[in-house]
Interface confidence: low
């Protein structure tokens, strides 16, 4: 066969769907690889062809679009399952071609089983709510395109296993779930089950997401440097190891990049000749506030090193701060015999 632009297996789009539920899967070519959409391709005389490789098989085979009740069908650039079966798991390929042009991409589709509490191997999206921030809402995700706007589905919300009814701060409102005041106790998995009719049959869509209650922007502050500080002096003799921790607290800020770095005499450690190592550790609070610690270490410090300026810097979307460490050379204790000699000499 003639050459085809093969984008390979697009593992970035690992698609997971629940068993025995409808699934609509768009050909990724038009979403991520080609600069034109399906309508343009279709009007230019290009044809979209689907085929698949079953799990644990190497053989590519056409998709059977003649199953009872049109269980698998194609509509424009969408492959439909009404509903899925467990053995639909495999790698699916969509190929766009005519006599002179060919482009294809494969993607994995995994049909997943869930238990009665909606637990499954499905990777869950995380929705972050600000703690005690006023009313916030989550929306039942990825249900667009399954039924026309004239169809009014029923939507039931669950927290973990439990139907959300009479929760004092969580209220189901159709496709939305409203949190009147988000608390740590609202952390957990929330599931919406959308039920709709189609051609005399009833279908269910199950969507689970994880709610994580995080620090509120109302309480966010610029980075706070706990160490170094004015109370601790790093007093060392030449030849000793110098260890200076820089410990910085960052309020949670959505999409903020938190940075901590050291400068030595105004330069980054990489830009100077002394043998310095820096180790970083990160911890998070329950509301995803972050504490970063960078320990600056010089194995055998010299007199010159003890005269340098060591400054810890921190930056977040809220601002930038810096703090110098107090480093000094330990004054050797006077030797007793010398003191005596001096004493006698003075009399």
């Amino acid at each position: 066969s003639e050459r085809c632009d093969d984008w390979g297996l697009d593992t970035m789009r690992q698609i997971q769907v629940f068993e025995d539920e409808p699934a609509r899967i768009k050909c990724p070519l038009f979403e991520h690889f080609l600069k034109f959409n399906y309508s343009t391709a279709h009007s230019a005389g290009l044809t979209l062809i689907w085929y698949w490789t079953r799990q644990d098989r190497d053989l590519e085979e056409p998709i059977n679009f003649r199953l009872p009740e049109n269980r698998i069908s194609k509509e424009k650039d969408v492959l439909w399952f009404r509903p899925t079966l467990l053995n639909d798991t495999g790698n699916y390929t969509c190929m766009l071609r005519n006599t002179t042009y060919c482009s294809k991409v494969a993607f994995p589709l995994e049909v997943v089983q869930k238990d009665s509490c909606f637990n499954s191997p499905m990777k869950l999206p995380v929705h972050k709510l600000y703690i005690e921030y006023g009313i916030q809402r989550i929306t039942c995700p990825n249900v667009d395109g399954y039924f026309p706007s004239s169809v009014k589905p029923t939507i039931t919300w669950y927290m973990g296993c439990y139907k959300i009814q009479n929760f004092n701060n969580v209220i189901p409102e159709g496709m939305n779930l409203s949190f009147l005041i988000a608390l740590i106790s609202n952390n957990g998995n929330y599931t919406c089950v959308v039920t709709y009719p189609e051609n005399g049959r009833t279908f269910h869509l199950t969507r689970t997401l994880t709610v994580k209650v995080v620090g509120s922007p109302k309480n966010a502050v610029p980075p706070v440097i706990h160490s170094p500080n004015d109370h601790v002096v790093y007093e060392k003799e030449p030849g000793e190891e110098l260890l200076i921790p820089c410990t910085v607290y960052f309020s949670f800020l959505m999409d903020s990049r938190n940075e901590v770095w050291w400068t030595i005499d105004g330069k980054k450690p990489d830009d100077i000749t002394i043998d310095v190592t820096i180790n970083e550790s990160i911890s998070h609070s329950r509301t995803e506030d972050e504490t970063r610690t960078q320990i600056l270490s010089i194995k055998k410090v010299t007199s010159e090193d003890l005269k340098r300026s060591y400054v810890c810097h921190a930056r977040s979307a809220k601002g930038e701060v810096a703090k110098a460490a107090k480093v000094k050379q330990k004054v050797p204790a006077p030797r007793y015999t010398v003191e005596l000699a001096c004493g006698f000499g003075a009399t």
């Epitope: 703690i131 005690e132 927290m159 973990g160 296993c161 439990y162 009479n166 929760f167 004092n168 701060n169 969580v170 608390l183 740590i184 106790s185 609202n186 952390n187 957990g188 509120s216 609070s285 329950r286 509301t287």
Partner: antibody, heavy 116, light 108 residues
Framework: SLEESGGRLVTPGTPLTLSCKVS????????MSWVRQTPGKGLEWIGT?????TTAYASWPKGRFTISKTSTTVDLKITSPTKEDTATYFC??????????????WGQGTLVTVSS | DVVMTQTPASVSEPVGGTVTIKCQAS??????LSWYQQKPGQPPKLLIY???DLESGVPSRFSGSGYGTEFTLTISDLESADAATYYC??????????FGGGTEVVVK
């Protein structure tokens, strides 16, 4: 650990504030409750203060209790004590980041006696 | 408000025996229920949360079961150290906090 204080003999109607000093953890990370136990009787939940300062109360005290906190203490104010408020008052820390709200850590309690 | 009813009020069993304590909620609280043990002069101690999950450090002789309105605490292979009063507590978000009346366990 949790350590309650402030329990004493008071006359009816005299406001009283109990304190719970926390150590080993931060009140910015845990919700806290007050529970009381009347002599020879069972346990009664009074209320909870969440990490952000929001409070929730049982319905039976009808507004006689107020819970507040600082960075290291959780306070329970009994605005107008009656003889029925004679009890040992416990503060307790909720379990943590699951939503089952169990009381996992308790103080030793402080005794309040209301008598004329 | 939810009301928690605990039975029996008192039970006596020999060392090595089994004790079953029941707790009934006046409305469904799903599995939002905890069990506590309290000895004289001491604060309560959490044994079980979420109806059946054992708190860390609690011996596996203690077990909890139930869902909705009916819950059970079972203590098997009874030891003298198990003599105490046991309480259930509703932890459901809309009606948090109510305790059962308590069950005194006497070990003979």
């Amino acid at each position: 650990s949790l350590e309650e204080s402030g329990g004493r003999l008071v006359t009816p109607g005299t406001p009283l504030t109990l304190s719970c000093k926390v150590s080993g953890f931060s009140l910015s990370s845990y919700d806290m409750s007050w529970v009381r136990q009347t002599p020879g009787k069972g346990l009664e939940w009074i209320g909870t203060i969440y990490i952000g300062g929001t409070t929730a109360y049982a319905s039976w005290p009808k507004g006689r209790f107020t819970i507040s906190k600082t960075s290291t203490t959780v306070d329970l104010k009994i605005t107008s004590p009656t003889k029925e408020d004679t009890a040992t008052y416990f503060c307790a820390r909720l379990q943590g980041a699951n939503y089952y709200n169990s009381l996992a850590l308790w103080g030793q309690g402080t005794l309040v006696t209301v008598s004329s | 408000d939810v009301v928690m009813t605990q039975t029996p009020a008192s039970v006596s069993e020999p060392v090595g025996g089994t004790v079953t304590i029941k707790c009934q909620a006046s409305q469904s609280i799903y599995s939002f229920l905890s069990w506590y043990q309290q000895k004289p002069g001491q604060p309560p101690k959490l044994l079980i949360y979420a109806a059946s999950d054992l708190e860390s450090g609690v011996p596996s002789r203690f077990s909890g079961s139930g869902y909705g309105t009916e819950f059970t605490l079972t203590i098997s292979d009874l030891e003298s150290a198990d003599a105490a009063t046991y309480y259930c507590q509703c932890n459901y978000i809309i009606d948090y906090g109510a305790f059962g009346g308590g069950t005194e366990v006497v070990v003979k």
